[in-house]
Amino acid sequence: SVTVHSSEPEVRIPENNPVKLSCAYSGFSSPRVEWKFDQGDTTRLVCYNNKITASYEDRVTFLPTGITFKSVTREDTGTYTCMVSEEGGNSYGEVKVKLIVLVPPSKPTVNIPSSATIGNRAVLTCSEQDGSPPSEYTWFKDGIVMPTNPKSTRAFSNSSYVLNPTTGELVFDPLSASDTGEYSCEARNGYGTPMTSNAVRMEAVERNVGV
């Protein structure tokens, strides 16, 4: 019987470092090895018939035990499939190796209204583009961490908001007077130093009533 396997199905490596993606196989007399890269809608062939393809040949080397990168970039993050077949035969096996290229978060950008109307919906956003894996976000009001559920802490029990740590969106609905304050957010992805945005003050103002 044929086997195709990797003892490292997930590899995490800091950007600009070398890395090897392992693929061990047995039971093939004349193995033909191919490596495919998948990331979202993108699919690329890295290795075809035991040879690295032109788009990778300057930085990837084929070895009988896997493929080795001289230096990885964030664009290399994705799933690599090692596919082994018998030349001229019908034996086939494959194994997937997930590569996560680690990049620390950059300073997050916030979108916070300087004033918002009490009783209305107010949307605050926080995002950063560099972090790999993608960052999770924590919001602060006046330097205090905002819990995901406002009712869980006395300090925020009068607030009504929904906080999404994955998207970085903070939605007040409805906004109350006590939501006035200085807001900032922190991005962290478990690699490198967490980064904090600038703090921006939001005033919760009464609705203008026409005379």
Partner: antibody, heavy 116, light 106 residues
Framework: QVQLVQSGAEVKKPGASVKVSCKAS????????MHWVRQAPGQRLEWMGY????????RYSQKFQGRVTITADTSTSTAYMELSSLRSEDTAVYYC?????????WGQGTLVTVSS | AIRMTQSPFSLSASVGDRVTITCKAS??????IAWYQQKPAKAPKLFIH???TLQSGVPSRFSGSGSGTDYTLTISSLQPEDFATYYC????????FGQGTKVEIK
């Protein structure tokens, strides 16, 4: 035939560092990752980390991260394992082992004794 | 991390006995287990890989079996040269050894 020959026994004081070598022959050194495994007296074998000699890429066990450094010299087909901030619990036999998927060939082992 | 629990810790047997050593993984390891023999002051020696594939030169009295989380090394008829310590290794996801089984003369 494949051979892995390690350096001789070492006696070190707590806080010091030790560097053990492993010279490979009988195969293409850059084709296979080289791992280090240790065995403290009466204990199970414990995986420490490895190096891909082709590009110098390393991976370490979380337990040893920050204290172990594995390097390779392709010109002499030699892998090295350096362990720093030694303590008495680091007294063990240290092995290098070639990886196919499992470990198929091992060095003879190097006894490192940490004693004040 | 995958944990490997090997049993028994030690066993006493006589020449000609049938000996069984087991290894239990903390999760399914998809048959990616190897067995090593180690004699005093020597390096471990690969005996079996991928559950049941005998390494070249290993006597046929050694066999391996199992699936999922439970695996077994069997020596059908113990010989004098088989007295040693045996270790299992899972290599499905990184590498973890069992604690070893010492096979002693009764």
């Amino acid at each position: 035939q494949v051979q892995l020959v390690q350096s001789g026994a070492e006696v070190k004081k707590p806080g010091a560092s030790v560097k053990v070598s492993c010279k490979a022959s009988g195969y293409s050194f850059t084709d296979y990752s080289m791992h280090w495994v240790r065995q403290a007296p009466g204990q199970r074998l414990e995986w420490m980390g490895y190096i891909d000699p082709y590009n110098g890429g390393t991976r370490y066990s979380q337990k040893f991260q920050g204290r172990v450094t594995i390097t390779a010299d392709t010109s002499t087909s030699t892998a090295y394992m350096e362990l720093s901030s030694l303590r008495s619990e680091d007294t063990a036999v240290y092995y290098c082992a070639r990886q196919t998927d499992y470990f198929d060939y091992w060095g003879q082992g190097t006894l490192v004794t940490v004693s004040s | 991390a995958i944990r490997m629990t090997q049993s028994p810790f030690s066993l006493s047997a006589s020449v000609g006995d049938r000996v069984t050593i087991t290894c239990k993984a903390s999760q399914d390891i998809n048959n990616y287990i190897a067995w090593y023999q180690q004699k005093p002051a020597k390096a471990p020696k690969l005996f079996i890989h991928y559950t049941s594939t005998l390494q070249s030169g290993v006597p046929s009295r050694f066999s391996g079996s199992g699936s999922g989380t439970d695996y077994t090394l069997t020596i059908s008829s113990l010989q004098p040269e088989d007295f040693a310590t045996y270790y299992c290794l899972q290599y499905d996801n990184l590498w973890t050894f069992g604690q070893g089984t010492k096979v002693e003369i009764k």
